[in-house]
């Protein structure tokens, strides 16, 4: 009933709880002297389904047959309407539509840990939409039985609160769950099991790792387990990997040696346990242990390259460059690099430890035969040294690679191609392709990049440290024993017209001609490799087309003579620069009047 129903009653037949698809009869009856005051014929009883009118009747009672009610609860309210007054609520009823419970399926019981309690889960089947009570029953040896009830609306789990012990691990227990509601009942199939079947060990805890003599090859994993555990699964992986290595061990007694770990690598370790070879289930995985393996001495050898620069008649500057070892080769934190410089004939040697850099520059005499050795050191030792003899890399003209070209290859890549040298191509032991940003001053601080290419290759794709709209000086070296030949070219991955023209800084007169000097365009405004400069001139105040002179771009050139100007005529001069993409805007304008005689 919805309220006190003082004025009348609502009755529901056959029941307030009905099977889906059934019909109910709802009767609303007024109690004596509870109708409209003046004339009972004007009593109008109205039946509402929720907030919608579904039937009415003039008189003291209303009968309504209702069909097609949906699953769940439907509220019916009966009201009285009298002339010239608000409707009065008489009474109401809720009707519950549902189904009998289906047979519970997949009943499964588990005891978490040797000290845990038995809990069971099952699948209820489709929702009954009615209050349904579940009773779980467990029977064991010696006619022992336990029972637990559950009155939650969605009940699919119950914990008996009892602990099975390993005294008789082969004893059988049987569980059954029964669902009951107003429309029927149904029981699951019985589930029979032993202690070993249902006890799921707690995950291992207190996991530790030890490296004997700080060596990765002598590594033992330790953990603690419940007493009856027979089997363990170990899984481990480098922290940056998604794939696990898996190991199964029997009777490990809380320790296992791992033999295939990589040095100086952070690993994640987890362990799981099981009580019996083929009965029961694995525990959850333990919490992860994260640990870094110890360092080992580096393997591999450094990739070393060098550059020579003439200083004066007796001295030369040597700049050595090397690449970091890969993580798998470094096998630890590289603390320093050891560079040894030796004059081969005199035997003089100089050793230096370099930290924080992968380059070293020194000045040596131009005479003598020099060699260098470079190795990388971590806390455990050093890599094998890379030894190279210092030679004139471009001395052997016959070893110079031919027809070197550099073409843009997609975003921030340059494809360098060449032809083998004229001299016996089979003499080439390797090619080295070197590139660095082009700086007009020939700045030695500009980072050097290089890659090595096998002797049968005639192309290389360079992509490391390549930026758009920057011009690179690219050299291809052919190395053969203690000889080398080289060819160079300029290249860029992406270009457009320069943003500005050269700035004329001086015009001087020399024997009837003029010499124009200019400042280079700043590198960030060149927008790629410059191909030409153009010098334009025309008579001041003239509307005629300017004359021009086009000069091929050379890195070091910043002046050029012009000898076709008339004396005592004032000219306006300016310059532009060109890349393969087009011409820059004008640089500054300068006026000049040649004083001397015409040629």
């Amino acid at each position: 009933k919805i309220d006190a129903c003082k004025r009348g009653d609502v009755t529901v037949k056959p029941s307030h709880v009905i099977l889906l698809g059934s019909t109910v009869n709802i009767t609303c009856s007024l109690k004596p002297r509870q109708g409209c005051f003046h004339y009972s014929r004007r009593n109008k009883l109205i039946l509402y389904k929720f907030d919608r009118r579904i039937n009415f009747h003039h008189g003291h009672s209303l009968n309504s047959q209702v069909t097609g009610l949906p699953l769940g609860t439907t509220l019916f309210v009966c009201k009285l309407a009298c002339i010239n007054s608000d409707e009065i609520q008489i009474c109401g009823a809720e009707i519950f539509v549902g189904v009998a419970p289906e047979q519970p399926q997949n009943l499964s019981c588990i005891q978490k840990g040797e000290q845990g309690t038995v809990a069971c889960t099952w699948e209820r089947g489709r929702d009954t939409h009615l209050y349904t009570e579940y009773t779980l029953q467990l029977s064991g040896p010696k006619n022992l039985t336990w029972q637990k009830q559950c009155k939650d609306i969605y009940c699919d789990y119950l914990d008996f609160g009892i602990n099975l012990t390993p005294e008789s691990p082969e004893s059988n227990f049987t569980a059954k769950v029964t669902a009951v509601n107003s429309l029927g009942s149904s029981s699951s199939l019985p589930s029979t099991f032993t202690f070993l079947d249902i006890v799921r060990p707690l995950p291992p805890w207190d996991i530790r790792i030890k490296f004997q003599k700080a060596s990765v090859s002598r590594c033992t994993l330790y953990w603690r387990d419940e007493g009856l555990v027979l089997l363990n699964r170990l899984r481990y992986r480098p922290s940056n990997s998604r794939l696990w290595n898996m190991v199964n061990v029997t009777k490990a007694k809380g320790r296992h040696d791992l033999l295939d770990l990589k040095p100086f690598t952070e690993y994640e370790f987890q362990i799981s346990s099981k009580l019996h070879l083929y009965k029961g289930s694995w525990s959850d995985w333990s919490e992860s242990l994260r640990a870094q393996t110890p360092e080992e001495e580096p393997t591999g050898m450094l990739d070393v390259w060098y550059m020579k620069r003439h200083i004066d008649y007796s001295r030369q500057q040597i700049s050595l460059f090397w690449k970091n070892l890969s993580v798998s080769e470094a096998r630890g934190k590289i603390l320093h690099y050891q560079v040894t410089l030796q004059e081969l004939t005199g035997g003089k040697a100089m050793t230096q430890n370099i930290t924080g850099h992968t380059s070293w520059t020194t000045v040596i005499p131009r005479t003598g035969n020099w060699a260098v050795a470079v190795s990388a050191a971590n806390s455990k030792g050093s890599s094998l040294p890379t030894r190279i003899n210092i030679m004139n890399l471009c001395e052997a003209g016959l070893l110079a690679p031919r027809q070197v070209s550099a073409n843009s290859e997609g975003m921030d890549n340059i494809l360098v191609t060449w032809q083998p040298p004229r001299k016996d191509p089979s003499a080439v032991q390797e090619y080295v392709v070197e590139w660095r940003e082009l700086h007009p001053g020939g700045d030695t601080q500009v980072p050097l990049n290089w890659l090595r290419s096998r002797p049968y290759n005639v192309s290389a794709l360079i992509s490391e440290n390549i930026k758009s709209y920057i011009c690179y000086e690219i050299r291809v070296y052919a190395l053969s024993g203690d000889q080398g030949g080289c060819s160079s070219i300029l290249g860029n991955s992406k270009h457009k017209a320069p943003l500005s023209g050269p700035h004329i800084n001086a015009i001087t007169e020399e024997k009837g001609s003029i010499l124009i000097s200019w400042n280079s365009i700043p590198v960030q405004e060149q927008m790629g490799c410059l191909l030409h400069y153009r010098i334009y001139w025309k008579e001041r105040d003239s509307n005629s087309q300017p004359q021009l002179c086009e000069i091929p771009y050379r890195v070091s050139q910043n002046s050029h003579p012009i000898n076709s100007l008339q004396p005592r005529v004032t000219y306006v001069l300016w310059m532009t620069a060109l890349t393969a993409a087009g011409e820059s805007s004008h640089g500054n304008e300068r006026e000049f009047c040649l004083q001397g005689k015409a040629n």
Partner: nanobody, 123 residues
Framework: QVQLQESGGGLVQPGGSLRLTCVAS????????MSWVRQPPGKGREWISA????????DYADSVMGRFTISRDNAKNTVYLQMNSLKSEDTAVYYC????????????????WGQGTQVTVSS
């Protein structure tokens, strides 16, 4: 699904009579109260009459009281509206509907209305 088919409309002179018929299908007719509704041209719909599921109680809007009579035949799944003393203001499209979708209390749902039948009262 619920289907309601109205018929019997037409052109009639003021003071004349018409009988509208509504045949229902797709639901248990005898357990549902039914209504007649009309929609004059250019105006909103207006509930005019209802009959309960047993056919023993009826209700009318004041505008048609004494002139219109609603009745039903549960054996034929049919509801009728006898209209007498018709006036020009009775001109409208007439629909039948389940009472739960349209009553004197609430006529907002068009879930189970029929297609309607046109009644025109004109001299």
């Amino acid at each position: 699904q619920v289907q309601l088919q109205e018929s019997g409309g037409g052109l009639v002179q003021p003071g004349g009579s018409l009988r509208l018929t509504c045949v229902a299908s797709g639901f248990p007719f005898s357990t549902h109260a039914m209504s007649w509704v009309r929609q004059p041209p250019g105006k909103g719909r207006e509930w005019i009459s209802a009959i309960n599921s047993g056919g023993d109680s009826t209700d009318y809007a004041d505008s048609v009281m004494g002139r219109f009579t609603i009745s039903r035949d549960n054996a034929k799944n049919t509801v009728y509206l006898q209209m007498n003393s018709l006036k020009s203001e009775d001109t409208a499209v007439y629909y039948c509907a389940k009472y739960e979708d349209c009553s004197d209390y609430d006529c907002s749902s068009r879930a189970s209305w029929g297609q309607g039948t046109q009644v025109t009262v004109s001299s």
